[in-house]
Amino acid sequence: AGVFELQIHSFGPGPGPGAPRSPCSARLPCRLFFRVCLKPGLSEEAAESPCALGAALSARGPVYTEQPGAPAPDLPLPDGLLQVPFRDAWPGTFSFIIETWREELGDQIGGPAWSLLARVAGRRRLAAGGPWARDIQRAGAWELRFSYRARCEPPAVGTACTRLCRPRSAPSRCGPGLRPCAPLEDECEAPLVCRAGCSPEHGFCEQPGECRCLEGWTGPLCTVPVSTSSCLSPRGPSSATTGCLVPGPGPCDGNPCANGGSCSETPRSFECTCPRGFYGLRCEVSGVTCADGPCFNGGLCVGGADPDSAYICHCPPGFQGSNCEKRVDRCSLQPCRNGGLCLDLGHALRCRCRAGFAGPRCEHDLDDCAGRACANGGTCVEGGGAHRCSCALGFGGRDCRERADPCAARPCAHGGRCYAHFSGLVCACAPGYMGARCEFPVHPDGASALPAAPPGLRPGDPQRYL
């Protein structure tokens, strides 16, 4: 058992150009607080995955009001450490997420509003009992400076808090085979009561006769290193030579209960009995109560009057997550018209419109023809945000400035010959065809298929297409 401790030294603008605007203003004073989430191992898990090693919220910092015209300074911080107790062995490798939250203290309806200012994450190796480790992390234009350490709670000692110490029975020395407990020289290492043969480096016990493995080790005596690469068959037998970790048949194999919870099999699954201060299906939730204000964005906290009972956040419309920290994706309803890009800014939806469109939802088609002229009698047509000219006969191009060759598209059917004419084109039809485009066959008896030839025109005469 032990405690992970986090000390925030400063939160403010990072070095370099583009200093962030102060998160608080005279109109909207605010204060900061922090949340830390710890997970065992060097896992690259999503921010939303459970904080299996535990989580903690800081107190609220002092109220801060920006001085007009002044650059954003380092912001005033909450007092004290963030402490995450762990009841189990300290894993040695861990992942962390540290979030900086802003509590706005303006005249919001329904109390203060919370918003996430910055989130930093990392993966570290850390031995329990060592000195404070210093770190600097950047999130956008913000910089967070902090220190952290893991320390064991007596009677536990060691880099994993797995060795136990007891007060000396004799004033001068420890019993046979037992060493003094550094740095507590007046105490002695307690006799190990683990299962016989349990690895002293990679195993530990909290009950007589048991042997529980540190992360990375497996086997009944914790002597087999876990390998993810050398297993030939994913469900083959476990062997001390390959060091393959094979899922056991029981639901409690590998103990799914975090934070020192004990697992018991049920007819259909498993059940975790959690230590004080933890709850959840796998004891993954640390003892935050409603008094800690865990619900963000105006969420209503229910239950959780003491650390042994779980709280539930009832989120206001538009927010979700166990702490109402996530916004629902409102852009999935595609409110922007005419191909506009939707941006959810939190307080409002914004649409970034394509060229030729404007308005809050890109609903206005801009008049592309304004100030544009189409030459040679052409008329301007709007559509799709693009300017287009409908050209008079004989002209083409974007602005109708080019003379068009009306015969270029070979408009005369059935081998008819095309002649350009000042008013358009004329088709000279091959024998047996007639019509403006030579599209109608002439029947052998002289009658045409459709329509009848106008009086005075014989089949085969050139026909002007007007």
């Epitope: 409102r330 309803l333 409110p335 922007c336 018209r337 506009g340 939806l349 809050p360």
Partner: nanobody
């Protein structure tokens, strides 16, 4: 102020059908986009079906061919006909609307939700 009032939720057996309704009322000049989201326990809220700002109809992949969205513009109401319901459709169904108000501003509104439970 704008209100979205959902109705039609309830308990149904797998393979059964339900029809949800959502009526919008208040200082509405026009409805730009309107549809249905759902949120199952412990899951993210997700879009089920909707009418976009361009009046296109969109559906989540998991409900295509089973759910149909329709609307009555005169009543500012949208409907979700749910057929061949499965256990995984169990969720709270929320109506959502992007509305242009009399002030010409646009605002996004949510209903309070209606519970749909699919169990044998």
């Amino acid at each position: 102020e704008v209100q979205l009032v959902e109705s039609g939720g309830g308990e149904v057996q797998p393979g059964g059908s339900l029809r949800l309704s959502c009526a919008a009322s208040g200082s509405i000049l026009s409805i730009n986009a309107m549809g249905w989201y759902r949120q199952a326990p412990g899951k993210q809220r997700e879009l089920v079906a909707g009418f976009t700002g361009d009046t296109n109809t969109i559906y989540a992949e998991s409900v295509k061919g089973r759910f149909t969205i329709s609307r009555d513009n005169a009543k500012n109401t949208v409907y979700l006909q749910m057929s061949s319901l499965r256990a995984e459709d169990t969720a709270v169904y929320y109506c959502a609307a992007d509305v242009q108000l009399f002030s010409r501003d646009y605002e996004f509104y949510w209903g309070q939700g209606t519970l749909v439970t699919v169990k044998p």
